[in-house]
Structures are given as structure tokens and as C-alpha cells.
């Protein structure tokens, strides 16, 4: 059965963009104009997950490409990183759960709960050009807030 | 509060088209599903198919591929669908509906129907 | 597609009586289930989604569970402006799909 998607940019709660920053990459950093363009579009795909009142489980896959957003433990930590798929088998409505964020929606500000690592969260740095990681703090210095800007399919 | 109000009833001759809207007000369009659903007289509820007005994105049901276009204009908060190749168990209420883009809220807001009479 | 089984298809019951109406999903709809009320020459009725939960301003006398595949809309005293057609919706898998409906009748 088709999983139920729509294609979307993020941006933190300082409206820095998201771009590739190498093959496996993200990093956060302000755009303007026509650099607007670089702004990786994903495909946001709800799946099944955990039963919750407040958080919807979504994959997050760049579209067009065969890449995941997915949380695995390196060096015993837990860290976000880009993973390739074979196209053919993804996106799927039971998604593994390294590839499965609970989306948490207040005030119309996003944030996204590794279902992996609960109270882990998508993170930015303050500071421009940094990669986008896995963070385990929220409401400290780091960025755990982003707005969804909705992209023609 | 949120409101659909959908286009008035329409009468057909068999093989005509007709469209059908449904302006929507109250909420941010672009974040909700539309979704389209029919009624034949005396019968049950029957899912014709969906769009995401900010996404552009459409899925329909396989039954109605063919049958049923739907459409949105952003700039008028309104979706529309158009049947085509109009038959007799065509007649029906048509109804749209409202689904917030993550689908969690269920169909929650209803416009109040559009009769649509296939009839020679 | 998914086949959304309702039953019965049709109950009488009295004021204050206690009613349940099932619908049974031939295939695990992850919780996308939904309750709609529609009474004669009039829109449905979005009563409850996602099994259980109440849309606002419906009173609290409607319930929703689920066992299962099993599904069950209840009202536990039944008021006069309850007796219309009850129908499920499960919105997992295209093509969403309906139950067939229960009218629920004063006896």
C-alpha cells in the first residue's frame, strides 16, 4: 500500500535552512534569494509508530534521492546521519524505527523525537554551517524548533 | 470557525461534465486535506479521493481515476472536482471534508453537500 | 482494499438505553479509525478520531474502543437527537473506505 507523504522544507526556530553538506550530510545555515534553491526538499511520510496523543511518527527521506534520515549509536552515542535505502523497498508504512521520528507539533513549531532514542531530538547549532545532529538537551543552547514551509510536489 | 460551503445543486444530461467546489474559510487552507466523498441516494459513504492544497499532492480512489479531477486554487481557498463522462449512478451528494496534513484529527469540518441530478 | 464490516445494520433502542455499534477492519488499521453520525438531508457528523478521541464540542456520552480489528462506538444513555445513521471510517490504507452503516432507530 503507498504510505502517505508530502514534500516539505524545514527550517529551526532562527530560520536557518538546511543544505547537504557532502554526499551524507546536513548542516544549518541562513539563505537568502536565490541560494533559497539549495535548501534540501523532503518527502515527510507518516508511518506507523507508537500510539501518543501529541506526536506523529514520520519518516523524513530527501526527495528524489534513495536517503533517510536515520538515528543509530556511534561510540555508544546516539547520532543522526543520512542513509542510503534501496528505492524499491522505501518509503514503507512499517519503517524501521531508526528511520522513525515523532513529529511534536505546538504553537505550530515542530520538533522531531528519535522514536530510537526517546528525548533525543533533530538539532541545530547557534552558530551558521554547522551539521545538523542528534541532540539529547532541550531548551538549552541548541536549536530543537523548526517550521515545515509546504513545496509543490 | 472554520467553514466549507460548497457550490450549489447541479442537473445533467448523461455524458457532460460537471465541477464541483468547496471555499473553505477559518483555517490556514494550504495545512488541511481536502477530501471528496459521495453519498447515492439511500446509500452509504464512498471516498473519492484527496489533495493537499499547499503540496499539490492528489491521491484518489483507483475506482474513481478517470472519473474524478481534483483541484485547488491557493489564492481563492478553494478546491474543486470535476466528474466527467457523466452516467445515471453518477447522481448523487457530493460532499467535501477536512483532514489536517498529518492525518490525525480525522474528517472533522463538512461542507453541506452538492446534489449533482444525471439525468436525460 | 480494506473492508470496513458494521454491525448491526440497523437498532432500535429506547431514550437512556445503553447502544454499541462495531465495525470490524479486515486488515490492521493502525488506529485511523473514525466515527461519523449523519442524519436525514444533512452532512455527516465527525463524532470521534483515532479510535478514542473526542472532537470538540461532542458530548461525552459517546465513547470509542478498540480490540484488535474490532472497533466499537458507544453511547452510553442514548438522548433524543441521537437516533440517525452511524458510520465508521478507516483512513490507514487507500482507498479510505466506510462501514455500511447502522440506523439507529427509537423503538
Known amino acids: 500500500a503507498p504510505v502517505r507523504s508530502l514534500n516539505c522544507t524545514l527550517r529551526d526556530s532562527q530560520q536557518k535552512s538546511l543544505v547537504m553538506s557532502g554526499p551524507y550530510e546536513l548542516k544549518a545555515l541562513h539563505l537568502q534569494g536565490q541560494d533559497m534553491e539549495q535548501q534540501v526538499v523532503f518527502s515527510m511520510s507518516f508511518v506507523q509508530g507508537e500510539e501518543s496523543n501529541d506526536k506523529i511518527p514520520v519518516a523524513l527521506g530527501l526527495k528524489e534521492k534513495n536517503l533517510y534520515l536515520s538515528c543509530v549509536l556511534k561510540d555508544d552515542k546516539p547520532t543522526l546521519q543520512l542513509e542510503s535505502v534501496d528505492p524499491k523497498n522505501y518509503p514503507k508504512k512499517k519503517m524501521e524505527k531508526r528511520f522513525v521520528f515523532n513529529k511534536i507539533e505546538i504553537n505550530n513549531k515542530l520538533e522531531f523525537e528519535s522514536a530510537q532514542f526517546p528525548n533525543w531530538y533533530i538539532s541545530t547549532s547557534q552558530a551558521e554551517n554547522m551539521p545538523v545532529f542528534l541532540g539529547g538537551t532541550k531548551g538549552g543552547q541548541d536549536i530543537t524548533d523548526f517550521t515545515m514551509q509546504f513545496v509543490s510536489s | 470557525q472554520v467553514q466549507l460551503v460548497q457550490s450549489g445543486a447541479e442537473v445533467k444530461k448523461p455524458g457532460a461534465s460537471v465541477k464541483v467546489s468547496c471555499k473553505v474559510s477559518?483555517?490556514?487552507?494550504?495545512?488541511?486535506?481536502i477530501e471528496w466523498v459521495r453519498q447515492a441516494p439511500g446509500k452509504g459513504l464512498e471516498w473519492i479521493g484527496e489533495?493537499?492544497?499547499?503540496?499539490?499532492?492528489?491521491n484518489y480512489n483507483e475506482k474513481f481515476k478517470g472519473k474524478a479531477t481534483i483541484t485547488a486554487d491557493t489564492s481563492t481557498d478553494t478546491a474543486y472536482m470535476e466528474l466527467s463522462s457523466l452516467r445515471s449512478e453518477d447522481t448523487a451528494v457530493y460532499y467535501c471534508s477536512t483532514i489536517y496534513y498529518d492525518y490525525d484529527q480525522g474528517f472533522t469540518y463538512w461542507g453541506q453537500g452538492t446534489l449533482v441530478t444525471v439525468s436525460s | 482494499d480494506i473492508q470496513m464490516t458494521q454491525s448491526p445494520s440497523s437498532l432500535s433502542a429506547s431514550v437512556g438505553d445503553r447502544v454499541t455499534i462495531t465495525c470490524k477492519a479486515s486488515q490492521d488499521i493502525d488506529r485511523y479509525l473514525s466515527w461519523f453520525q449523519q442524519k436525514p438531508g444533512k452532512a455527516p457528523k465527525s463524532l470521534i478520531y483515532?479510535?478514542?478521541r473526542l472532537v470538540d464540542g461532542v458530548p461525552s456520552r459517546f465513547s470509542g474502543s478498540a480490540s484488535g480489528t474490532d472497533y466499537t462506538l458507544t453511547i452510553s444513555s442514548l438522548q433524543p437527537e441521537d437516533f440517525a445513521t452511524y458510520y465508521c471510517?478507516?483512513?490507514?490504507?487507500?482507498?479510505?473506505?466506510f462501514g455500511q452503516g447502522t440506523k439507529l432507530e427509537i423503538k
Open positions: 477559518g483555517y490556514t487552507f494550504s495545512r488541511y486535506w
Open positions: 483515532r479510535v478514542k
Open positions: 489533495i493537499l492544497p499547499g503540496n499539490v499532492n492528489i
Open positions: 471510517l478507516q483512513y490507514d490504507e487507500f482507498p479510505y473506505t
